[in-house]
């Protein structure tokens, strides 16, 4: 014998109480499945969440971050705050970068700024603490009858680390 | 460094109402992301959820309770309240006053809570 | 409303003992699961979020694990300091908790 509840489309549930016939999803909840006994209640996106995608009878809701913060975790399960480009969060809050660091991001951590003479080359431009350098050709590539490049934004006093 | 402070607990009548506050101090009550709520346990028994207030001062309660408690803040006190009406001897509780999230990272879990304030209600 | 329930109720354990408690939701609520550990006449204090993330400041001993409706903590090499009463919490629609397992010395 087919189980009655089989036939029960996605946005019911199986209603045990009525002689197993398809009730519709009470407000508030959804079946994203056929042949569901019972419609699970929606995802509130509540407090530093806000509504990126509105319940439906067959969908849960999907959430986001209210601005100035970003989504971490498997369906925006936590929000992380937001920093400025050239700084890192800490357990204290948004610090700038150290000198020789940078972030280009609202998120994640300063990262070193590339090693030019590692791959033979020459800094082009030097790097910010929200730019990395620019490397540019090697020194040696650079004979004197050569178009010029653009000169490098003034270096910053070396040991100085801003917090 | 986050501290919550509650007060306003005491022996009150049945019937009678309450009003609790929670000092905060180390962040402000009105800071993006912030929610700070209420929990209360009673004697020997579990830990029972029942208002939270977010930075945007909107109001989340306890279904089985909402028509009871009120929950609001002041900002300029820093100082977030519980008012809770028609008392009985079940409300007989430790209110706890705690924070919404981590230091950075903000979700649906509370980091920071108070040392609680016994509510006693007999007549 | 989404209820959890904890199992077992309480537990008794020793020193070094591997410790699981259990946590299931009475509806699929993905990883919106905390942690939290209460010692008599003191407020709980988070011990997991977001169903396995560990808390600043927390021994690597315990951890979290679990999605949807089943989650469990686990104690690795229970300390003196361990016994006391865990509670999980979800915050996926409201915020509920569970009603606590309690860790005895055996």
């Known amino acids: 014998l087919q189980d009655p509840c089989s036939n029960c489309p996605a946005g019911t549930f199986c209603d045990n109480n009525r002689n197993q016939i398809c009730s519709p999803c009470p407000p508030n909840s959804f079946s994203s499945a056929g042949g569901q006994r019972t419609c699970d209640i929606c995802r509130q996106c509540k407090g530093v969440f806000r509504t990126r995608k509105e319940c439906s009878s067959t969908s849960n809701a999907e959430c986001d971050c209210t601005p100035g913060f970003h989504c971490l975790g498997a369906g925006c399960s936590m929000c992380e705050q937001d920093c400025k480009q050239g700084q890192e969060l800490t357990k204290k809050g948004c610090k700038d970068c150290c000198f020789g660091t940078f972030n280009d991001q609202k998120r994640g951590i300063c990262r070193p700024w590339t090693n030019c003479s590692l791959d033979g080359k020459s800094v082009l431009v030097n790097g910010t603490k929200e730019r990395d350098v620019v490397c540019g050709p090697s020194p040696a590539d650079l004979s004197p009858g050569a178009s010029s490049v653009t000169p490098p934004a003034p270096a910053r006093e070396p040991g100085h680390s801003p917090q | 460094e986050v501290q919550l402070v509650e007060s306003g607990g005491g022996l009150v009548q049945p019937g009678g109402s309450l009003r609790l506050s929670c000092a905060a101090s180390g962040f402000s009550l009105s800071t993006g992301g912030v929610g700070v709520g209420w929990i209360r346990q009673a004697p020997g028994k579990c830990l029972e959820w029942l208002a939270l207030?977010?930075?945007?001062?909107?109001?989340y309660y306890s279904p089985s309770l909402k028509s009871r408690l009120t929950i609001s803040r002041d900002n300029s006190k820093n100082t977030l309240y519980l008012q809770l009406n028609s008392l009985r001897a079940e409300d007989t509780a430790v209110y706890y006053c705690a924070r919404g999230g981590s230091d950075t990272v903000i979700g649906d879990w509370f980091a920071y809570w108070g040392q609680g304030t016994l509510v006693t209600v007999s007549s | 409303d989404i209820q959890l329930t904890q199992s077992p109720s309480s537990l008794s354990a020793s020193v070094g003992d591997r410790v699981t408690i259990t946590c299931r939701a009475s509806?699929?609520?993905?990883?919106?699961l905390a942690w939290y550990q209460q010692k008599p006449g003191k407020a709980p204090k988070l011990l997991i979020y977001?169903?396995?993330n560990l808390e600043t400041g927390v021994p690597s001993r315990f951890s979290g694990s679990g999605s949807g409706t089943d989650f469990t903590l686990t104690i690795s090499s229970l300390q003196p300091e361990d016994f006391a009463t865990y509670y999980c919490?979800?915050?996926?629609?409201?915020?509920?908790f569970g009603c606590g397992t309690k860790v005895e010395i055996k």
């Open positions: 977001d169903a396995s």
């Open positions: 207030i977010d930075w945007a001062d909107d109001k």
């Open positions: 919490q979800q915050g996926y629609y409201l915020w509920t």
């Open positions: 509806q699929s609520i993905g990883s919106y």
